[in-house]
């Protein structure tokens, strides 16, 4: 025997107390599939959340975060304060990255600079609070007689001092 509730479309609920008639979901609630015996209460984007997509009778609202905050968790279940590049969020607020660490985003934690020597390379550009170090060629590559190809120095005309 077919369940009479299976005839109730999305956006309605099957009312057990009314001989299983299909009743529309009230405002600010939804059912995303047919045959449901209840409607889900719509998510409300309040406070630091803002509405990215309004709730409808067949789908939930979607939230994101107000400027200065970013989403965390599945479906933006939390909003976390942004920090500046070169900082990380602690229990006491945004704090500068310690020496030897960096953060190039407005979220997340400060990470240690890359240790170029672990890869046998030298530091080409020093790190900052906002940027990782840039590793250059290995010291062996810079030694005399190394096979790396370097362009010849431009010829100077006699009688001219270097610029």
């Amino acid at each position: 025997l077919q369940d009479p509730c299976s005839n109730c479309p999305a956006g309605t609920f099957c009312d057990n107390n009314r001989n299983q008639i299909c009743s529309p979901c009230p405002p600010n609630s939804f059912s995303s599939a047919g045959g449901q015996r209840t409607c889900d209460i719509c998510r409300q984007c309040k406070g630091v959340f803002r509405t990215r997509k309004e709730c409808s009778s067949t789908s939930n609202a979607e939230c994101d975060c107000t400027p200065g905050f970013h989403c965390l968790g599945a479906g933006c279940s939390m909003c976390e304060q942004d920090c500046k590049q070169g900082q990380e969020l602690t229990k006491k607020g945004c704090k500068d990255c310690c020496f030897g660490t960096f953060n190039d985003q407005k979220r997340g934690i400060c990470r240690p600079w890359t240790n170029c020597s672990l890869d046998g390379k030298s530091v080409l550009v020093n790190g900052t609070k906002e940027r990782d170090v840039v590793c250059g060629p290995s010291p062996a590559d810079l030694s005399p007689g190394a096979s790396s190809v370097t362009p010849p120095a431009p010829a100077r005309e006699p009688g001219h001092s270097p610029q």
């Epitope: 609920f13 009230p26 405002p27 600010n28 015996r37 209840t38 409607c39 889900d40 209460i41 998510r43």
Partner: nanobody, 120 residues
Framework: EVQLLESGGGLVQPGGSLRLSCAAS????????VGWFRQAPGKGRQYVGT??????HYGDFENNRFTISRDNSKNTVYLQMNSLRAEDTAVYYC???????????????QGQGTLVTVSS
């Protein structure tokens, strides 16, 4: 932690009226449907009704004798009960859920209940 506190129960004569209140602490009712259930002595739990967003849904026993309403400013939901009968004697519980109606639902939170006795 959400706490629901029912009040307004007591002894009433058959044919009389009572208004039960349900107040929430720790959270507003804004995001929740609010329901009422009752449990008579020695009986199972029975669904009374659910309120959400201006709409009320009722159990199949009450025949328009019960009305659920809400006062947003007081963060309180009411159950107005008229033409009371002896068989309405029960502990009445307030509950909240993210589902509407709550007829087939286990609530997210439920209060301790208030006793209504209908007797002459």
């Amino acid at each position: 932690e959400v706490q629901l506190l029912e009040s307004g129960g007591g002894l009433v004569q058959p044919g009389g009226s009572l208004r039960l209140s349900c107040a929430a602490s720790g959270r507003t009712f804004d995001n929740y449907a609010v329901g009422w259930f009752r449990q008579a002595p020695g009986k199972g739990r029975q669904y009374v009704g659910t309120y959400w967003s201006g709409y009320a849904h009722y159990g199949d026993f009450e025949n328009n004798r019960f009305t659920i309403s809400r006062d947003n400013s007081k963060n309180t939901v009411y159950l107005q009960m008229n033409s009371l009968r002896a068989e309405d004697t029960a502990v009445y519980y307030c509950a909240i859920s993210l589902k509407y109606p709550m007829a087939t639902v286990t609530p997210d939170y439920q209060g301790q209940g208030t006793l209504v006795t209908v007797s002459s």
